[in-house]
């Protein structure tokens, strides 16, 4: 029960990619507003997105303080124009989110192939080290900085003339693969965190093929 015409938020859902983290919920407000609070399991509640009519709240600034912590959020519902009003229990209606551990749960963003270079029968493929919103010593950390060797990349590569995808893996951002002389190859990469049980893979990078601008060919 709560104040007349005030309903509790529901379907609280974390949407997070490369640590950019937004809490979403329902319903679209009718004569009510929302405030979000976030806390670690052992910490104090911090209020965000005060008296908003949105049904989402960007909590990135809070979760990047320690991405290995487990966070809980809650969404308070208030009557529009009367935010001091409380429910029958003496406090506003609220709903808890599921727990969220960014390090284990943030989705891996789509990677990008930065470059590839062929030297004879070897090709070096480099994956862009994407910047995150996680900070250390006032600088933004890359995905590799945050995950270290927990993050690997799987390279799919194939001759332009065939469909079978060979694979290679690296725990850096570079691959060195053997190719057949005189053949053009295409490449796509996928970020993977094998130690996870869910959200292990990113979507595939855009496909890049030899003979396009990103690559360089050198005959040795």
């Amino acid at each position: 029960s709560g104040t007349t015409n005030t309903v509790a938020a529901y379907n609280l859902t974390w949407k997070s990619t490369n640590f950019k983290t937004i809490l979403e919920w329902e319903p679209k407000p009718v004569n009510q507003v929302y405030t979000v609070q976030i806390s670690t399991k052992s910490g104090d509640w911090k209020s965000k997105c005060f008296y908003t009519t949105d049904t989402e709240c960007d909590l990135t600034d809070e979760i990047v303080k320690d991405v290995k912590q487990t966070y809980l959020a809650r969404v308070f519902s208030y009557p529009a124009g009367n935010v001091e009003s409380t429910g029958s229990a003496g406090e506003p209606l609220y709903e808890n989110s599921p727990e969220f551990t960014p390090y284990l749960e943030t989705n891996l963003g789509q990677p990008t192939i930065q470059s590839f270079e062929q030297v004879g029968t070897k090709v070096n493929v480099t994956v862009e080290d994407e910047r995150t919103l996680v900070r250390r010593n006032n600088t933004f950390l890359s995905l590799r900085d945050v995950f270290g060797k927990d993050l690997i990349y799987t390279l799919y590569y194939w001759k332009s003339s065939s469909s079978g995808k060979k694979t290679a893996k690296t725990n850096t951002n570079e691959f060195l693969i053997d190719v057949d002389k005189g053949e053009n190859y295409c490449f796509s990469v996928q970020a993977v965190i094998p130690s996870r049980t869910v959200n292990r893979k990113s979507t595939d990078s855009p496909v890049e093929c030899m003979g396009q601008e990103k690559g360089e060919f050198r005959e040795i």
């Epitope: 060979k166 694979t167 290679a168 893996k169 053997d178 996928q190 094998p194 049980t197 869910v198």
Partner: antibody, heavy 120, light 107 residues
Framework: EVQLVESGGGLVQPGGSLRLSCAAS????????IHWVRQAPGKGLEWVGY????????YYADSVKGRFTISADTSKNTAYLQMNSLRAEDTAVYYC?????????????WGQGTLVTVSS | DIQMTQSPSSLSASVGDRVTITCRAS??????VAWYQQKPGKAPKLLIY???FLYSGVPSRFSGSRSGTDFTLTISSLQPEDFATYYC?????????FGQGTKVEIK
């Protein structure tokens, strides 16, 4: 508990077709890779091919290329091996296996296998 | 394709014996080598991964090592349940390839 269960094996005539299924439980196949490996009677292990169920990418051994097709239905958490133009030398126990996908660990869980006999 | 040449193809040993099986890769595979145990009518089971790491639940009498492109599986003290066929496998490149297998029999 991670489990892989193959089904669909049986007796088929040369030139015939068969579809094997690999039903997974205890994990989501799109988070991993699924391989098929076969073993002819009294022989060693031979890799057949793999699929990444997340994007549908596949690769096949030369011995089956153009005849076998691996697919996956992520809604059913099941991978398939479609075998066409079967030959006597395809007679084997067919296993599906999960690829953990790290640099260190490859095939960590295997199914119990299903026997395919190609004979007239 | 990378060839994995496994030896011996079979061996006879007694309970308590130290048993060594080797695999040679035809080119560099780094440490991307696994060892599997297979008993008749059963699926292979992972024993060793990344050349030398013991997989969860595998007895410590099993060990693996690498020297360049040579890989070794050692059973320090053979137990009755260890009589089986053992396979090495490389997963450094596609296609992954297996050794021919080593059957460990009772002497």
């Amino acid at each position: 508990e991670v489990q892989l269960v193959e089904s669909g094996g049986g007796l088929v005539q040369p030139g015939g077709s068969l579809r094997l299924s690999c039903a997974a439980s205890g994990f989501t196949i799109s988070d991993y890779w699924i391989h098929w490996v076969r073993q002819a009677p009294g022989k060693g292990l031979e890799w057949v091919g793999y699929i990444d169920p997340y994007n549908g990418y596949t690769y096949y051994a030369d011995s089956v290329k153009g005849r076998f097709t691996i697919s996956a239905d992520t809604s059913k958490n099941t991978a398939y091996l479609q075998m066409n133009s079967l030959r006597a030398e395809d007679t084997a126990v067919y296993y599906c296996a999960r690829d953990y996908g790290s640099l260190e660990v490859s095939l960590d869980y295997w199914g119990q296998g299903t026997l395919v006999t190609v004979s007239s | 394709d990378i060839q994995m040449t496994q030896s011996p193809s079979s061996l006879s040993a007694s309970v308590g014996d130290r048993v060594t099986i080797t695999c040679r890769a035809s080119q560099d595979v780094n440490t991307a080598v696994a060892w599997y145990q297979q008993k008749p009518g059963k699926a292979p089971k992972l024993l060793i991964y990344s050349a030398s790491f013991l997989y969860s639940g595998v007895p410590s009498r099993f060990s693996g090592s690498r020297s360049g492109t040579d890989f070794t599986l050692t059973i320090s003290s053979l137990q009755p349940e260890d009589f089986a066929t053992y396979y090495c496998q490389q997963h450094y490149t596609t296609p992954p390839t297996f050794g021919q297998g080593t059957k460990v029999e009772i002497k």
